[in-house]
């Protein structure tokens, strides 16, 4: 807490100016007006405060606006906002895309740091749903920043604003995340022709179920092996070794060297040694010709 | 040990067909799909296609998808690649490869020592 | 499909010297590079797989680094022996493709 002393005579500033920057933190604290602060706020960013007087500058606004700044202020605070706890910001009222933005590029190139998780936790709820516009801005920030949701959180996305989401926003994303977006992207993408929207929906597909593995296997098209790999295991079981040869195409010879990782391994269990030889890459483990297979899980519906 | 034996010359007449052989032997012919690799006079390599011997089920590089046709027969061992409707620019010598699956799609290990093909009247 | 280019195209060097011969690939292709050695009349001979992994009896004058989209491949200790063409290869796709070629000649 800077103490309250009276400014010396000549020295009370009629502007946020780089004189400014010879003021002892005692000066700043007794000669800045915090209204005037508060209208010329874009003026601070441009003069090069040592961190202690920012910090007195910060104090200011806080006396000022005690229950939170009004955006006026938050959209030009630029580097004050790295000196603003997350307290602080639960306090404030952000609506504007440009003041979230504005404030993003502040610490552009960091991690996320726990104001702007705090930031960015108003924003979305204030807007009430993660829209397209948001969704946009905040992945061209932060790559990963859908996968840091909860699945919870995520259900709010609508469907329209997975068209903001780019293959790389979703490589942190674990499959109780796919789960959510997988069934919103379908939606989203669902007017599109066939290899258009297998191109949009393909990173999505960690969230699939057998059926629409098997719809896809249908269309020709392609998929390749990394997308494989990260399709759920229990979707990938069902199908057959003629309707993953179709869903792979040319990827299908990618097989082999992944014979020992899931989903391949519990895939190559669960198919006849027969079906399995047809793909012409020694694969081994299925089950022997001759052998009944019994579906437990079907006989367990049905008792 | 592995071997892909592959005849070494064919001549043919401009507009004819080919059809080149690739003989395996020392592995499991099933096991492992074939490709098919190109090399015309003083330029580098191109894939063309490979075959899945097992079900014979092909995959082409489009530039050569009406070109070469890719067949096998498991009986022999032996791969073909058919060339039809043949110019100049077919003359080249012509491999067959067996990949090797460590990693990926799998690296050619095992070349056969190709078969030059000479197309003119 | 993914492009692999290679260069130079041609390069001379001494006996006993180093050469170093480079493939850019048109997108990421994960260190799935294989190198191979080609001379007349005979299939190409695998020298180095997984961008630096030395194929069994391949001397260690040969080798190989990389990752990305950019890969080099050297020779140290040049012997006659090494007078080929050299290639990369590209696996990370099913639809594989080679870089265009180096030969290297001996001063």
């Known amino acids: 807490e800077v103490e309250k002393t009276a400014c010396p005579s000549g020295k009370k500033a009629p502007e946020i100016d780089e004189s400014l920057i010879f003021y002892k933190k005692w000066e700043l604290e007794a000669c800045v007006d915090a209204a005037l602060l508060a209208t010329q706020m874009d003026r601070v960013n441009a003069i090069p405060f040592t961190y202690e007087q920012l910090d007195v500058l910060k104090h200011k606004l806080d006396e000022l606006y005690p229950q939170g700044y009004p955006e006026s202020v938050i959209q030009h605070l630029g580097y004050l906002f790295l000196k603003m706890s997350p307290e602080d910001i639960r306090k404030w009222n952000v609506t504007s895309l440009e003041t979230l933005k504005a404030l993003l590029e502040v610490n552009k190139g960091h991690e996320m740091s726990p104001q702007v998780a705090t930031l960015i936790d108003r924003f979305v709820k204030g807007r009430g749903q993660l829209d397209k516009d948001t969704l946009d801005t905040l992945t061209a920030f932060y790559p990963g920043y859908l996968c840091s949701l909860s699945p919870e959180e995520l259900s709010s996305v609508p469907p329209s604003s997975i068209w903001a989401v780019r293959p790389q926003d979703l490589d942190t994303c674990d499959p109780r995340q796919l789960d959510v977006l997988y069934p919103k992207a379908r939606l989203a993408f669902q007017n599109m022709n066939g290899s258009e929207y297998f191109v949009k929906i393909q990173s999505f597909l960690g969230g699939a179920p057998t059926e629409d593995l098997k719809a896809l296997s249908q269309q020709n098209v392609s998929m390749d092996l990394a997308t494989f790999m990260k399709l759920r295991t229990d979707a990938v079981l069902p199908l057959t070794v003629a309707e993953v040869q179709k869903l792979l195409g040319p990827h299908v010879e990618g097989l082999k060297a992944e014979e020992r990782h899931r989903p391949v391994r519990d895939w190559i269990l669960r198919q006849r040694q027969d079906d399995l030889d047809t793909l012409g890459l020694g694969l081994q483990g299925g089950i022997p010709n001759g052998y009944l297979v019994l579906d437990l899980s079907m006989q367990e519906a049905l008792s | 040990q592995v071997q892909l034996q592959q005849p070494g010359t064919e001549l043919v007449k401009p507009g004819a067909s080919v059809k080149l052989s690739c003989k395996a032997s020392?592995?499991?012919?099933?096991?492992?799909?074939m490709h098919w690799v190109k090399q015309r006079p003083g330029q580098g390599l191109e894939w063309i296609g490979n075959i899945n011997p097992s079900n014979g089920g092909p995959y082409y590089n489009e530039r050569f998808r009406s070109k070469a046709t890719l067949t096998v027969d498991k009986s022999s061992s032996t791969a073909y690649m058919q060339l039809s409707s043949l110019t100049s620019e077919d003359s080249a010598v012509y491999y067959c490869?067996?990949?090797?699956?460590?990693?990926?799609?799998?690296?050619?290990?095992?070349w056969g020592q190709g078969t030059t093909l000479t197309v003119s009247s | 499909d993914i492009q692999m280019t290679q260069s130079p195209s041609s390069l001379s060097a001494s006996l006993g010297g180093k050469v170093t011969i480079t493939c850019k690939a048109s997108?990421?292709?994960?260190?799935?590079i294989a190198w191979y050695q080609h001379k007349p009349g005979k299939g190409p001979r695998l020298l180095i797989h997984y961008t630096s992994e030395l194929q069994p009896g391949i001397p260690s004058r040969f080798s190989g680094n990389g990752s990305g989209r950019d890969y080099s491949f050297s020779i140290s200790n040049l012997e006659p022996e090494d007078i080929a063409t050299y290639y990369c290869l590209q696996y990370a796709n099913p639809l594989r493709t080679f870089g265009g070629g180096t030969k290297l000649e001996i001063k």
């Open positions: 997108q990421d292709i994960n260190k799935y």
């Open positions: 020392g592995y499991t012919f099933t096991n492992y799909w």
């Open positions: 490869a067996r990949p090797y699956y460590g990693s990926s799609y799998g690296y050619f290990d095992y």
